[in-house]
Interface confidence: medium
């Protein structure tokens, strides 16, 4: 019966995780709007997946109440300092709730890159990763957003990307 | 559409100052630099400047530093080139054009209609 | 500064042949697998028309014979077969770092 017992429990626990919301979406031409709006995410091809999570217009929807574990990853990287750039880059994910007008912050890094081309070199790279666990409700939504988008790097899906799973 | 409107033909002594304003409309004027080129008479396309209207930054030619002033007013979308000392070698038609979104790929997607600005004693 | 070099200095083409541009940049233009060098015809009495930017984007609203094409020095502007209204005056202009800088030009003329 021990043996047996162990089985079923782990083909439990197999089949609990199948179904466990993940999704990992990744950078593409459009993901830069120019709008002021969050970054726009592929979300089929290549890498990009959807499951047990839906998207909306830049935003990751939780469809399951739960603990997620959600990340960010932001290639940075330029010739020079772009004129108008703001002191420093901020790279956050942010939370939208029905219950609340605004924009919530959850993770949230700040920095200063183009201070790293030099004289003999006017290319520069940075990047910015964020992830953490957070509790978040059914119909919530969470988004990336990066101030001065015009930094950042796509190129292809692996640089720059956006996901989450249930924990 | 987007649309820059220059300021009307100068005519200038050698030694004075101009100033050429450039009225944008049809997009997001915070959002995009705007560029200053220059072209003499049967000649070339040569950059001066550009500056951004979101915060008033600005980008010169180290030809044209401590003689061109770039400077932006965002509550009447226009963008204004200040140029001092003038010299018969600054006759030219002056243009604005917007620069793209992305910084790293400054090309010029749209062009003011050009001011001729004539510098003579 | 990087410089832009433009040949030939004038190029004669009949109506309906291809024209093919060149330009040379005194060092690399190139960046994260893109070129920065944008292509513009200019017409007497009035601005500049940005034609194609970072090497082979087509402008919207530019009609598909032209092209452009190149990386790091080397670029090249190409219109497959020339209408009238194409005669006219082309730059290549860099945008990899200020000041940015245009070539001296190529007069199209009709031959």
């Known amino acids: 019966d021990g043996p047996a017992g162990s089985w079923e429990q782990l083909i439990q626990e197999r089949r609990s995780h199948e179904v466990n919301p993940a999704a990992h979406l990744t950078g593409a031409n459009s993901s830069l709007t120019g709008s002021g709006g969050p970054l726009l995410w592929e979300t089929q091809l290549g890498l990009a997946f959807l499951r047990g999570l839906s998207y909306h217009d830049g935003a990751l929807v939780v469809t399951k109440a739960g603990y997620y574990y959600i990340y960010s990853k932001v290639q940075l990287g330029g010739v020079g300092c772009p004129l108008g750039l703001a002191s420093t880059i901020t790279h956050g994910l942010y939370k939208r709730t029905p219950r609340y007008p605004e924009e919530l912050e959850l993770l949230v890094s700040q920095q200063s890159p183009c201070g790293r081309a030099t004289s003999s070199s006017r290319v520069w790279w940075d990047s910015s990763f964020l992830g953490g666990v957070v509790h978040l409700e059914a119909g919530e939504e969470v988004v990336v957003r990066v101030l001065d988008e015009r930094l950042v790097r796509l190129r292809d899906g692996t640089r720059s990307y956006f996901g989450a799973f249930m924990v | 559409q987007v649309q820059l409107v220059q300021s009307g033909a100068e005519v200038k002594k050698p030694g004075a100052s101009v100033k050429v304003s450039c009225k944008a409309s049809?997009?997001?004027?915070?959002?995009?630099?705007v560029h200053w080129v220059r072209q003499a008479p049967g000649q070339g396309l040569e950059w001066i400047g550009a500056?951004?209207?979101?915060?008033?930054?600005?980008s010169y030619n180290q030809k044209f530093k401590g003689r061109a002033t770039l400077t932006a007013d965002k509550s009447t979308s226009t963008v204004y080139m200040e140029l001092s000392s003038l010299r018969s070698e600054d006759t030219a038609v002056y243009y604005c054009?917007?620069?793209?979104?992305?910084?790293?790929?400054?090309?010029?997607?749209?062009w003011g209609q050009g001011t001729l600005v004539t510098v003579s004693s | 500064e990087i410089v832009m070099t433009q040949s030939p200095a004038t190029l004669s083409v009949s109506p309906g042949e291809r024209a093919t541009l060149s330009c040379k940049a005194s060092?690399?233009?190139?960046?994260?697998?893109?070129?920065?060098m944008n292509w513009y015809q200019q017409k007497p009495g009035q601005p500049p028309r940005l034609l194609i930017y970072?090497?082979?984007n087509l402008e919207s609203g530019i009609p598909a014979r032209f092209s452009g094409s190149g990386s790091g020095t080397e670029f090249t502007l190409t219109i497959s077969s020339l209408q009238s209204e194409d005669f006219a005056v082309y730059y290549c202009?860099?945008?990899?770092?200020?000041?940015?800088?245009f070539g001296q030009g190529t007069k199209l003329e009709i031959k």
């Open positions: 054009a917007r620069g793209s979104y992305y910084y790293t790929s400054s090309y010029f997607d749209h």
């Open positions: 049809g997009y997001t004027f915070t959002s995009y630099n």
């Open positions: 500056v951004y209207p979101g915060n008033g930054d600005t």
């Open positions: 060092q690399s233009v190139d960046f994260d697998g893109d070129s920065y």
């Open positions: 970072t090497a082979s």
């Open positions: 202009q860099q945008s990899y770092e200020d000041p940015f800088t």
